[in-house]
């Protein structure tokens, strides 16, 4: 008699999934090799050990701390780079601009990242069906919950000028429900951080209007001043121009705005 | 049983380029880092660069940045380094190479080599 | 970049002996060093790997030790069979870089 599964709204765990969290690992510190400290096994485990055998509607932040700690990384706080609803460009950026880093930069970003993942209570298996969707099911699902703590250590971890690429395609370019403004935003530390710098990434090829200027962006503005936090905006109207001067910087096309 | 296969010898002449591809079997190619080593003859061996196939990243060592792109295609599960502005110091047996799971960071695998003869 | 320094680059034994090659490191890379043998056209096979550890289905006969900076490879007793080039390699920071090589060859 097959046993009685609970169907979630969301799309299951990634197939491949423990096999793709520790070859990822593996790969990640072949890459870095200032994370070679780090036992992938272990990792695996204390990832498997946050959501194995417990409701994937009662995720919480304590259950990934082990995962955190094997985690734990350094990356200069002055040089990071947050996002919101534009990864690719985001990713190649810092791939070109080698000294920045994203979170899917850093182990537990990259270890994570377009991964889906759930289990189910009482039971070691893992939920290749179904996973519960964030709006449909539950917030506190293995994945939510995995990204809202790792993007709020980041935050915290950052200091100085902190970056933020912005998409201006967006009806919302800055979405208070979004990772960035619901949790990133918030946890950035005024005591640390001076400046918060939008970078306001344009879509369409004519599109030469200040984006800056957008209602969702003086909304963010707002928000960073109140918390004691110097706000500060750039249109970024040709992202293609941009890339490729962030690559040849000394192109004599590159003076002119991008 | 993991495979790397590489293409085959090239001859080409100064200020050419020459895309080299190394196919993989036998374990999931988004699963490893690729790496490229160069061989000149009589010479010893010179790590050149790698990419992560899953993400497309890549690292080229200084001396043949500008020069060595290398790519991956995961539809094909193939990677590739492409050298351009051959020069004759250029000609050498580049190999792709890559890390296993029980031997450290060492390249327990290895793709046979292609020969690249630059000559005018 | 890190300099490895490999010696001898060419040495003649006979068979039966006790081969030894070293390496030196520019700068500390803990155990992070690798050996490998290569026979002319064939493509490099790794003997060692994190200094000491031999690689699966190596003879017993090949060894290698050190840590920091200071690396050794041993062959125990030279057979016919290992006449071929041997490298080390640094795998601690990018760029990996290897040594210059040592020819061995039987006398």
């Known amino acids: 008699v097959p046993r009685w599964r609970q169907q979630w709204s969301g799309p299951g765990t990634t197939k491949r999934f423990p096999e793709t969290v520790l070859a990822r690992c593996v790969k990640y510190t072949e890459i870095h090799p200032e994370m070679r400290h780090v036992d992938c096994q272990s990792v695996w485990d204390a990832f498997k050990g946050a959501f194995i055998s417990k409701h994937p509607c009662n995720i919480t932040e304590e259950d990934y701390q082990p995962l955190m700690k094997l985690g734990t990384q350094t990356v200069p706080c002055n040089k990071i780079l947050l996002w919101s609803r534009i990864k690719d460009l985001a990713h190649q950026f810092t791939q070109v601009q080698r000294d920045m880093f994203t979170l899917e930069d850093t182990l537990l970003g990259y270890l994570a990242d377009d991964l889906t993942w759930c289990g189910e209570f009482n039971t070691s298996k893992i939920n290749y069906q179904s996973c519960p969707d964030w709006r449909k099911d539950c917030s506190n699902n293995p994945v939510s919950v995995f990204w809202k703590t790792v993007s709020r250590r980041f935050a915290e971890a950052a200091c100085d000028v902190v970056h933020v690429m912005l998409n201006g395609s967006r009806s919302k370019i800055f979405d208070k429900n979004s990772t960035f403004g619901s949790v990133e935003v918030h946890n950035l530390q005024p005591e640390k951080v001076q400046t918060l710098e939008a970078w306001v990434i344009h879509g369409g090829r004519e599109d030469s209007r200040d984006l800056c200027q957008d209602p969702t962006i003086k909304e963010l503005e707002s928000i960073i001043s109140k918390r004691n936090i110097q706000f500060s905006c750039k249109n970024i109207y040709r992202p293609d121009k941009f890339l490729q001067c962030v690559k040849n910087p000394e192109d004599s096309s590159c003076t002119s705005e991008i | 049983e993991v495979q790397l296969v590489q293409s085959g010898a090239e001859v080409k002449k100064p200020g050419a380029t020459v895309k080299i591809s190394c196919k993989v079997s036998?374990?999931?190619?988004?699963?490893?880092?690729m790496n490229w080593v160069q061989q000149a003859p009589g010479k010893g061996l010179e790590w050149m660069g790698w990419?992560?196939?899953?993400?497309?990243?890549?690292d080229v060592a200084e001396k043949f940045q500008g020069r060595v792109t290398i790519t991956a295609d995961t539809s094909t599960d193939t990677a590739y380094m492409e050298l351009s502005s051959l020069r004759s110091e250029d000609t050498a047996v580049y190999y792709c190479?890559?890390?296993?799971?029980?031997?450290?960071?060492?390249?327990?695998?290895w793709g046979q080599g292609t020969t690249v003869t630059v000559s005018s | 970049d890190i300099q490895m320094t490999q010696s001898p680059s060419s040495l003649s034994a006979s068979v039966g002996d006790r081969v030894t090659i070293t390496c030196k490191a520019s700068?500390?890379?803990?155990?992070?060093v690798d050996w490998y043998q290569q026979k002319p056209g064939k493509a490099p096979k790794l003997l060692i790997y994190?200094?000491?550890n031999r690689y699966t289905g190596v003879p017993s006969r090949f060894s290698g030790s050190g840590s920091g900076t200071d690396f050794t490879f041993t062959i125990s007793s030279l057979q016919p069979e290992d006449i071929a080039t041997y490298y080390c390699?640094?795998?601690?920071?990018?760029?990996?870089?290897f040594g210059g090589g040592t020819k061995v060859e039987i006398k």
């Open positions: 190479a890559r890390t296993g799971y029980n031997s450290g960071y060492g390249f327990p695998y």
């Open positions: 036998g374990y999931t190619f988004t699963d490893s880092v």
């Open positions: 990419i992560d196939p899953e993400y497309g990243r890549t």
């Open positions: 700068q500390n890379v803990d155990s992070d």
């Open positions: 994190k200094a000491s």
């Open positions: 390699m640094q795998s601690n920071t990018h760029p990996r870089t």
